[in-house]
């Protein structure tokens, strides 16, 4: 809401998730694995990557189905805490300028910092508009303090904020899963809120920091070459 | 249990304006949009527009611009629909209905709407 | 405005028999579309959401298909119960919210 159209492939991290349709947003972290939302998550999904408009065969996409999808095994549906979930692609992405892997953060988000938030949500607060090319949107980082102000008791160390107190600019449906970059980092997963573009409302993302470990521990588990003793 | 009680028929002469209400009882009014639906005898449905209870904000049907007014009143969880300057072919039956989709503590993934709950309808008559 | 049309718009079943109602959209709506169920002298009901989803309460033998701008609803074993209108409705684009016209499946 409030964004912008993306320069096509200027987000070469950013991928689709199908299941015959757009559903969910996802970040590209390596050649064979996505992060998303936790509440992304489905039986069978679809990864589709370089990605802009996705009712279009542009050229530059790639179609790999998901051979495993891993949720965080600490997930609450109930509050959102712990909304993240890895996907193993089943083939290994071919890496070009188009398409290529977001970093992991080194440390944790700092309030007013400038982000790129991107995907193929619900562009209006009021009513649906669901568009066909990527969506971007910049946006600072907020303070726990003011993330905690605008939703009393529902934030966790594991959430932050980024947009707008006054409204106007936010994810929103169909954002799901998608990245919120800074310093080209992977600091956000778009996650909830209140509404979208509400005053005094703004989006909640999980703290990706917080997984880093999980991340790396999960995909060394779930790597063929690993040694068995 | 979930429901959507209407306000009862109204006959109306050209120019007037007719208020329907709809109250809701079994859930949180504040958390779903509240749309209003018409239906002309023998025709199919046509959306009027829709009302966000918690913010308020509305959205109308181009063709009801101007002369459509949707409010709520939150305290008494009640929904209305004001239609201005009737005309006879304003003759139908107007429902309420609630989309099922959960306004508040929204997670962002693409939401799949629907009118889950339709209330019984109101026959609005216009007649000279 | 996205255009939502319906076909046939009168489809003669014997109970029993398989329906199938079909529902165009004049753009891709992705799998943001319902199917209800109206009886005359009643609101409409919700059969299907999502494209094909079944609503809380909705014998299995409604079942709903399709994306993008195709959809089709499908009625496997018709009931006397079952005779009525259907009308789709996209919610990918509002607004305006718009329906088809309407399928009548009456007894043949």
């Known amino acids: 809401v409030g964004g912008y159209i993306c320069e096509e492939n200027s987000v070469p991290y950013q991928v689709s998730l199908n299941s015959g349709y757009h559903f969910c947003g996802g970040s590209l972290i390596s050649e064979q694995w996505v992060v998303s939302a936790g509440h992304c998550y489905k039986s069978r999904i679809q990864v589709r990557l370089g990605e802009h408009n996705i009712e279009v065969l542009e050229g530059n996409e790639q179609f790999i189905n998901a051979a495993k999808i891993i949720r965080h095994p600490k997930y609450n549906s109930r509050t959102l805490d712990n909304d993240i979930l890895l996907i193993k692609l089943s083939s290994p992405a071919v890496i070009n300028s188009r398409v290529s892997a977001i970093s992991l953060p080194t440390a944790p988000p700092a309030a007013g910092t400038e982000s790129l938030i991107s995907g193929w949500g619900n562009t209006l607060s009021s009513g649906a508009d669901y568009p066909d090319e990527l969506q971007c949107l910049d946006a600072p980082v907020l303070s726990q303090a003011e993330c905690e102000a605008s939703y009393p008791g529902k934030i966790t160390n594991n959430m932050f904020c980024v947009g707008f107190l006054e409204g106007g600019k936010d994810s929103c449906q169909g954002d799901a899963g998608g990245p919120v970059v800074s310093n080209g980092e992977l600091q956000g997963i778009v996650s909830w809120g209140y509404g979208c573009a509400q005053k005094n409302r703004p989006g909640v993302y999980t703290k990706v920091y917080n997984y880093v470990d999980w991340i790396k521990d999960t995909i060394a588990a779930n790597s063929h070459h690993h040694h068995h003793h | 249990q979930v429901q959507l009680v209407q306000s009862g028929a109204e006959v109306k002469k050209p120019g007037a304006s007719v208020k329907v209400s709809c109250k809701a009882s079994?859930?949180?009014?504040?958390?779903?949009?509240m749309h209003w639906v018409r239906q002309a005898p023998g025709q199919g449905l046509e959306w009027m527009g829709a009302i966000n209870p918690y913010s308020g904000q509305t959205n109308y049907a181009q063709k009801f611009q101007g002369r459509v007014t949707m409010t709520r009143d939150t305290s008494i969880s009640t929904a209305y629909m004001e239609l201005s300057r009737l005309r006879s072919d304003d003759t139908a039956v107007y429902y309420c209905?609630?989309?099922?989709?959960?306004?508040?503590?929204?997670?962002?993934?693409?939401?799949?709407?629907?009118?889950?709950?339709w209330g019984q309808g109101t026959t609005v008559t216009v007649s000279s | 405005e996205i255009v939502m049309t319906q076909s046939p718009a009168t489809l003669s079943v014997s109970p029993g028999e398989r329906a199938t109602l079909s529902c165009r959209a004049s753009?891709?709506?992705?799998?943001?579309l319902a199917w209800y169920q109206q009886k005359p002298g009643q609101a409409p009901r919700l059969l299907i959401y999502g494209a094909s989803t079944r609503a809380t309460g909705i014998p299995a033998r409604f079942s709903g298909s399709g994306s993008g701008t195709e959809f089709t609803l499908t009625i496997s074993s018709l009931q006397s119960e079952d005779f009525a209108v259907y009308y789709c409705?996209?919610?990918?684009?509002?607004?305006?919210?718009?329906f088809g016209g309407g399928t009548k499946v009456e007894i043949k």
């Open positions: 753009q891709s709506v992705g799998s943001n």
């Open positions: 409705q996209q919610f990918h684009n509002w607004p305006p919210l718009t």
């Open positions: 079994g859930y949180t009014f504040e958390g779903h949009y």
């Open positions: 209905a609630r989309d099922f989709v959960l306004l508040l503590r929204q997670s962002r993934i693409l939401h799949e709407s629907a009118f889950d709950i």
